[in-house]
């Protein structure tokens, strides 16, 4: 009994999210793996976050609502190994936003979902930023290695969502 | 006080080339974008090409991407526009202008006198 | 691209009445309180001069009859009172994405 109120809320859930994401693809996670952990399909999942990549090339804003349409924003990122996760899906010869950006160009950075922007957890390429003109962030491949650098706002690119695994 | 002299315009046969020039003054040039406008007779404004400051970056309309090229010297304040295989459309008055970066985006805060290029047989 | 479609093409007005120009973008030119929409000036024989920078800014040296207004897709330029040296063609312009497209133009003119 206990189990079929559990699946009963389960496809209440996902008929609720369908009409978001025509179609998810779920992993069984938790203790007991008693929970399922989504993410829209093709998006790929890393830790607690899915991921898209657009290849559709759009300046910084047009990036962000259409992150925003699909119930996500430009990808925020936090440590060295999310960054690694996300890049092994890049290509090398692309260009893709961040949701980093400093509208005044005074040189203060900030993320899209207000987190804290920390000069530590940074990955600019060298030399990089270096226009207080050029006030969004990219990751690109340079030198041998993925990293940041600041770019016009305007100029489109490609770009990548990240949103929270839907639970259900 | 911020100038933009341009000069480099003229008669030019269909399929031949011009090489337009904008000498600036008044402002670091270095640290500014900039842009060429056009306006063809009796016409509205159509922008041509932008530079970045640091020549970083080049950007081009379909009408004129791959005949015309945008390029600067920050050492002699100077910006050019190369144009090879003009035609009849390209006859226009053509304006340089500093871009002013606000936000997102940025406007054209100066503009010069324009340089007048006609292309005819 | 952005097209920017401006209404009226042209407009006579007489001294010190209001002059309303508009500008709608096929799509928005405004984010989260930013709206990347600017208004020129142009006489006759002379370069477009800036009038208003991100919808409602006035340039420096140009007079408060002067004013801007809308966010998303819609602006709005108005110049009230109109005087006599008023007259001249009006563009807006987007910058929120590359290319930036002008307005076809607003021809003003004086009764």
């Known amino acids: 009994n206990f189990m079929y109120s559990k699946t009963v809320k389960r496809l209440s859930k996902l008929q609720e999210y369908q009409q978001y994401y025509p179609s998810l693809t779920c992993v069984m996670e938790g203790k007991d793996m008693e929970d399922w952990s989504c993410c829209p399909t093709p998006w790929t999942s890393f830790q607690s976050s899915c991921y898209f990549i657009s290849t559709v090339m759009q300046s910084w804003t047009k990036s962000q609502n259409n992150c925003s349409v699909m119930g996500a924003d430009l990808v925020v990122i936090n440590t060295k190994e999310e960054q690694d996760f996300i890049t092994q899906n890049l290509k090398i010869n692309s260009a893709y936003f961040l949701g980093l950006s400093d509208p005044k160009g005074w040189r203060h950075w900030q993320w899209v979902d207000q987190t804290p922007y920390n000069k530590n957890v940074t990955f600019w390429h060298s030399g990089e930023p270096n226009s207080p003109d050029e006030r969004c962030a990219i990751i690109n491949f340079r030198s041998e290695e993925w990293g940041w650098n600041d770019v016009h706002c305007h100029v489109p690119q490609k770009s990548i969502c990240k949103m929270k695994k839907i639970y259900i | 006080e911020v100038q933009l002299v341009e000069s480099g315009g003229g008669l030019v046969k269909p399929g031949g080339s011009l090489r337009l020039s904008c000498a600036a003054s008044g402002f670091t040039f270095s640290s500014y974008g900039m842009s060429w406008v056009r306006q063809a007779p009796g016409k509205g404004l159509e922008w041509v090409a932008t530079i970045s400051s640091g020549d970083s970056y080049t950007y081009y309309p379909d009408s004129v991407k791959g005949r015309f090229t945008i390029s600067r010297d920050n050492a002699k304040n100077s910006l050019y526009l190369q144009m090879n295989s003009l035609r009849a459309e390209d006859t226009a008055v053509y304006y340089c202008?500093?871009?002013?970066?606000?936000?997102?985006?940025?406007?054209?805060?100066?503009w010069g006198q324009g340089t007048t290029v006609t292309v005819s047989s | 691209d952005i097209v920017l479609t401006q209404s009226p093409a042209s407009l006579a007005v007489s001294p010190g009445q209001r002059a309303t120009i508009t500008c709608r973008a096929s799509?928005?030119?405004?984010?989260?309180?930013?709206?990347?929409m600017h208004w020129y000036q142009q006489k006759p024989g002379q370069p477009p001069k800036l009038l208003i920078y991100a919808a409602s800014n006035l340039e420096s040296g140009v007079p408060a009859r002067f004013s801007g207004s809308g966010s998303g897709t819609d602006f709005t330029l108005t110049i009230n009172p109109v005087e006599a040296n008023d007259a001249a063609n009006y563009y807006c312009?987007?910058?929120?994405?590359?290319?930036?497209?002008f307005g076809g133009g607003t021809k003003v003119e004086i009764k």
């Open positions: 312009q987007q910058s929120i994405e590359d290319p930036p497209t």
């Open positions: 202008a500093r871009q002013l970066y606000y936000s997102y985006g940025y406007y054209f805060d100066y």
């Open positions: 799509e928005s030119v405004s984010f989260h309180g930013t709206h990347l």
